[in-house]
């Protein structure tokens, strides 16, 4: 399986909400002994491997933000802890999973990583990640809504 990031760059005004998205692609084994663990964290560029450094998102670690279920089942994070920090991660039946960040500030700017771990009990774990950048802007040059840039091209889309 692979992880796709539909958008590689999100440019948002301060105070806006944004939903960062990843998508699980390829054949997904739905066997009894296969589980998918999905989570989010911040990272930084300039390392040996993108997303190898795991930093908290608004003081919540990747363990706090994880989703757990088998295959393409829907799931949500522990609501109370995440929502107190203006965060919510979710997953649907089609392999899409996301993290929503509310009331963005300049401090939220940076590189974000989604992580999917395929757990084959009795065998091994297989971890795959996707990366995207969030730029939070303020002032007269800031967009009125979030603008997203697809990973495959530099055409931008306005999202509200």
């Amino acid at each position: 399986f692979k992880v796709a990031t539909p958008y590689s760059l999100y440019v948002c005004p301060e105070g806006q909400n944004v939903t960062l998205t990843c998508r699980l692609l390829g054949p997904v084994d739905k066997g009894h002994d296969v589980t998918f663990y999905k989570t989010w964290y911040r990272s930084s560029r300039g390392e040996v491997q993108t997303c190898s450094e795991r930093r908290p998102i608004r003081n919540l670690t990747f363990a706090d933000l994880h989703l757990h279920h088998g295959g393409h089942q829907a799931a949500n994070t522990s609501h109370d802890l995440a929502q107190r920090h203006g965060l919510e991660s979710a997953s649907d039946h089609h392999g899409n999973f996301s993290i929503t960040m509310r009331n963005l500030t300049l401090l939220d700017s940076g590189l974000y990583c989604c992580l999917v771990v395929e757990i084959r009990h009795h065998h091994s774990e297989h971890a795959v990640h996707g990366a995207m950048e969030l730029q939070v802007q303020t002032g007269k040059d800031a967009p009125s809504n979030c603008v997203v840039y697809p990973s495959s091209s530099q055409d931008s889309e306005n999202i509200t």
């Epitope: 009894h32 002994d33 589980t35 663990y37 491997q49 190898s52 450094e53 795991r54 990747f62 363990a63 994880h66 757990h68 088998g70 522990s78 992580l115 771990v117 757990i119 009990h121 009795h122 065998h123 091994s124 774990e125 971890a127």
Partner: antibody
Framework: QVQLQESGPGLVKPSETLSLTCTVS????????WSWIRQPPGKGLEWIGY???????NYNPSLKSRVTISVDTSKSQFSLKLSSVTAADTAVYYC???????????WGQGTMVIVSS | EIVLTQSPATLSLSPGERATLSCRAS??????LAWYQQKPGQAPRLLIY???NRATGIPARFSGSGSGTDFTLTISSLEPEDFAVYYC?????????FGGGTKVEIK
């Protein structure tokens, strides 16, 4: 803050079954791996096995024929049973939370089990 | 199973000195390696995961490096509370295995 607490008899007779329980407090057991690890006196650490919240288990091949790990999510507990024990099974037994693609981030304080007649 | 060999078995140093601990794997574990600290009578404590990520609350004087088969835990300037036994652990394959440990003792 998640905390783990092991409980069970500190003395087991040879050939009998060692039974320990780990109680998870301050957080949900419905995620992560929940592992048992042991440490014989003055020696290193040995992973015994885990149970995933879904009920899937995975055991160290060196102990697999004697080990059973089970979970009771309603009580936020998981348990270890080790059958046909010998003096070589004397150790401090730890329960721990293991995060996928990460490490054992939270440990119980450990409980000493002596196998002796 | 993957065998982890730690060296040296014992490291005798003074407070303020730099400690360098080694862990070598019998086959590549990529960067799926963790380090733990254990003091007498206590449970191990996670220091580093994924070779170099510091666990929550771990001081910056602890750092990890390496990938593949050779890994290093460095304590930049030893504090009195750092004298303990340190274990490495791999998680690329089950069974999960630990190294034999390195004891860091006061010189």
């Amino acid at each position: 803050q998640v905390q783990l607490q092991e409980s069970g008899p500190g003395l087991v007779k040879p050939s009998e079954t060692l039974s320990l329980t780990c109680t998870v407090s301050g957080g949900s057991i419905s995620s992560y791996y929940w592992s048992w690890i042991r440490q014989p006196p003055g020696k290193g650490l040995e992973w015994i096995g885990y149970i995933y919240y879904s009920g899937s288990t995975n055991y160290n091949p060196s102990l697999k024929s004697r080990v059973t790990i089970s979970v009771d999510t309603s009580k936020s507990q998981f348990s270890l049973k080790l059958s046909s024990v010998t003096a070589a099974d004397t150790a401090v037994y730890y329960c721990a939370r293991d995060i996928p693609a990460s490490a054992f981030d939270i440990w119980g304080q450990g409980t000493m089990v002596i196998v002796s007649s | 199973e993957i065998v982890l060999t730690q060296s040296p078995a014992t490291l005798s140093l003074s407070p303020g000195e730099r400690a360098t601990l080694s862990c070598r794997a019998s086959q590549s574990v990529s960067y799926y390696l963790a380090w733990y600290q254990q003091k007498p009578g206590q449970a191990p404590r996670l220091l580093i995961y994924d070779a170099f990520n510091r666990a929550t609350g771990i001081p910056a004087r602890f750092s990890g490096s390496g990938s593949g088969t050779d890994f290093t835990l460095t304590i930049s300037s030893l504090e009195p509370e750092d004298f303990a036994v340190y274990y490495c652990q791999q998680r690329i394959n089950w069974p999960l295995t630990f190294g034999g440990g390195t004891k860091v003792e006061i010189k």
